[in-house]
Each structure stands twice: as structure tokens, then as C-alpha cells.
């Protein structure tokens, strides 16, 4: 990973594009910290393992988060 100690936040660009929950391998929500003062959302896609930074403020991404958390709550006992 091209990461040096001087890099504070992971996302160079963010995407508003809706993501199909079925095409998601993993969804990471990185809370704001001393290194990066904003929340970052990183989607790992099943296709080629591509990772994509998502815009936490986008309506489509908020809907995705709801859908994913709903799916998780269904699965958890």
C-alpha cells in the first residue's frame, strides 16, 4: 500500500455512485481520528477486489449503509 506517515486520510476522491449491496465484498466505516478528522467509507467490491471510497454525505451511500445494516441485523441471532 502506498502509504507514508504523512498521509492523513485514505480517500483521495470520493464517489456518490450507488453501489449494489450484492456486489459488495466488504464495507468499512473508518471513524474520524487524530490522523483523519472525517469519517471514511471504503467499499471492497467482489469484482477484482476493487476498493472504492464512498461519500458519507451522499443519499445513495446513506441508503446503502441502511441496507447493509438491515441485512446484518437479519443475519445476527
Amino acid at each position: 500500500v502506498p502509504l507514508s506517515r504523512t498521509v492523513r486520510c485514505t480517500c483521495i476522491s470520493i464517489s456518490n455512485q450507488p453501489v449494489n449491496p450484492r456486489s459488495l465484498e466488504k464495507l468499512e466505516i473508518i471513524p474520524a481520528s487524530q490522523f483523519c478528522p472525517r469519517v471514511e467509507i471504503i467499499a471492497t467490491m467482489k469484482k477484482k477486489g476493487e476498493k472504492r471510497c464512498l461519500n458519507p454525505e451522499s443519499k445513495a451511500i446513506k441508503n446503502l449503509l441502511k441496507a447493509v445494516s438491515k441485512e446484518r441485523s437479519k443475519r445476527s441471532p
Partner: antibody
């Protein structure tokens, strides 16, 4: 459609300063990292600087560190390159380029939109 | 710092022929960080391939990218007249910096 338009180039004497601008349209400028890339006459491409979508990080090629500053004004959809202590070897076409949607330190989507460039000539 | 080398420097081919362009890194590069660009005289570069093998939006399927580690390849399956240009590979490396190769010129035989 997505467009980037550079301005501010010109002929300048060694040691002087110049500020380049790049105005974006057709996409949400505040969502994308931005780059400056240059091309000396008859030569290949050389990356100069990058700025994260929110200005949180800025990085430079070694040859311009301490002389050039990249910045952005998301309210004006504009990217800047402040160039100080200019040298003859800075003579080039300067392009601004958009970092692809969703790019991060774990996956790189390339520079997917480019301006037509502005020419900087440093000559004494 | 990773250095990219492209070969050949110039490739002379005829329309309809297959072009194979090589990009070699001085040390291993993750395929996630490798891109290819096309530049025609007097024009800005255009992104062709990202992630070593994914075509950018609007790029015809005669362009394909492959490779891993230190060796990457751009293939143009059948050259069209508009494909004669200079092609650059580029990698995103630590620090972070974005390094271009010196380019391969594809010209008409």
C-alpha cells in the same frame, strides 16, 4: 460534459513567480482529488503535485518541493498551482487532471479527465 | 523510488496489426496501482486502463491490459488509424508519488 480549463501560463524570467488556475465544470469538483502534470517540450509526462478532494493531503515531486504549492477552492471549482523561484527546467505545458471517482490509497482509478494545458516558459 | 521502463521506445506497425507494449518496474508494483494513458500530438493524455487491466469509461475493447509484479503489458488487438500515438504507463507509489514511464511511440510502418 466534464471539463477542465487551465489558465495563467506565460513567459517569465528565472527566479520569478506564476500562478496557474484550473477551472472545473460538469462534475462535483469537491469530490475529486486533483493533480498537476507537466510535459517539457518534446519530452514525456512528469507528475508534479496532487491534492486530496478536501485539501487534507498535498504531495509534490521532489524537484518542485518548497517552490510550488498546490491548493484548491471548492466553492469556486478551481485548482491552483503557485510556482515560485522558477527555473529554466520548469518550462513545460502544465496540465491539470482529475483523480478518478473513489480513488484512495488502497486502489487507484487513474487520472480520468484532463485539461488541454497551459504553457509556461521560463527564459531570461 | 520505483522507476518505470517502457519498451520498445518506438513500435512501427500497420493498421490491423497487433501491438504489444511493455512496462517494467524496478521493483514490484501492486496491479491496483498501474495505469496506461494514450497521448496524440498536440492533445492532452487520455486514460485507457486502470488497475492494470480495467478499461476506463468509453475505451474500446481492442485495448487490454495485463501483468503483475514488475511486468505489465498493454495490448491493442487490431490497430486502428486513430491508435497511432504515444502510450505511457504510470504507477502510484509510496510517499505518495505518481510516476510515469518514458513512453512508447506507436507509429505507422
Amino acid at each position: 460534459q466534464m471539463q477542465l480549463v487551465e489558465s495563467g501560463g506565460g513567459v517569465v524570467q528565472p527566479g520569478r513567480s506564476l500562478r496557474l488556475s484550473c477551472t472545473a465544470s460538469g462534475f462535483t469538483f469537491s469530490n475529486n482529488g486533483m493533480h498537476w502534470v507537466r510535459q517539457a517540450p518534446g519530452k514525456g509526462l512528469e507528475w508534479v503535485a496532487v491534492i486530496w478532494f478536501d485539501g487534507m493531503n498535498k504531495f509534490y515531486v521532489d524537484s518542485v518541493k518548497g517552490r510550488f504549492t498546490i491548493s484548491r477552492d471548492n466553492s469556486k471549482n478551481t485548482l491552483y498551482l503557485e510556482m515560485n523561484s522558477l527555473r529554466a527546467e520548469d518550462t513545460a505545458i502544465y496540465y491539470c487532471a482529475r483523480e478518478g471517482d473513489g480513488s484512495g490509497i488502497y486502489y487507484y482509478y487513474g487520472m480520468d479527465v484532463w485539461g488541454q494545458g497551459t504553457t509556461v516558459t521560463v527564459s531570461g | 523510488e520505483i522507476v518505470l521502463t517502457q519498451s520498445p521506445g518506438t513500435l512501427s506497425l500497420s493498421p490491423g496489426e497487433r501491438a504489444t507494449l511493455s512496462c517494467r518496474a524496478s521493483q514490484s508494483v501492486s496491479s491496483s496501482y498501474l495505469a496506461w494513458y494514450q497521448q496524440k500530438p498536440g492533445q492532452a493524455p487520455r486514460l485507457l486502463i486502470y488497475g492494470a487491466s480495467s478499461r476506463a469509461t468509453g475505451i474500446p475493447d481492442r485495448f487490454s491490459g495485463s501483468g503483475s509484479g514488475t511486468d505489465f503489458t498493454l495490448t491493442i488487438s487490431r490497430l486502428e488509424p486513430e491508435d497511432f500515438a504515444v502510450y505511457y504507463c504510470q504507477q502510484y507509489g509510496s510517499s505518495p508519488i505518481f510516476t510515469f514511464g518514458p513512453g512508447t511511440k506507436v507509429d505507422i510502418k
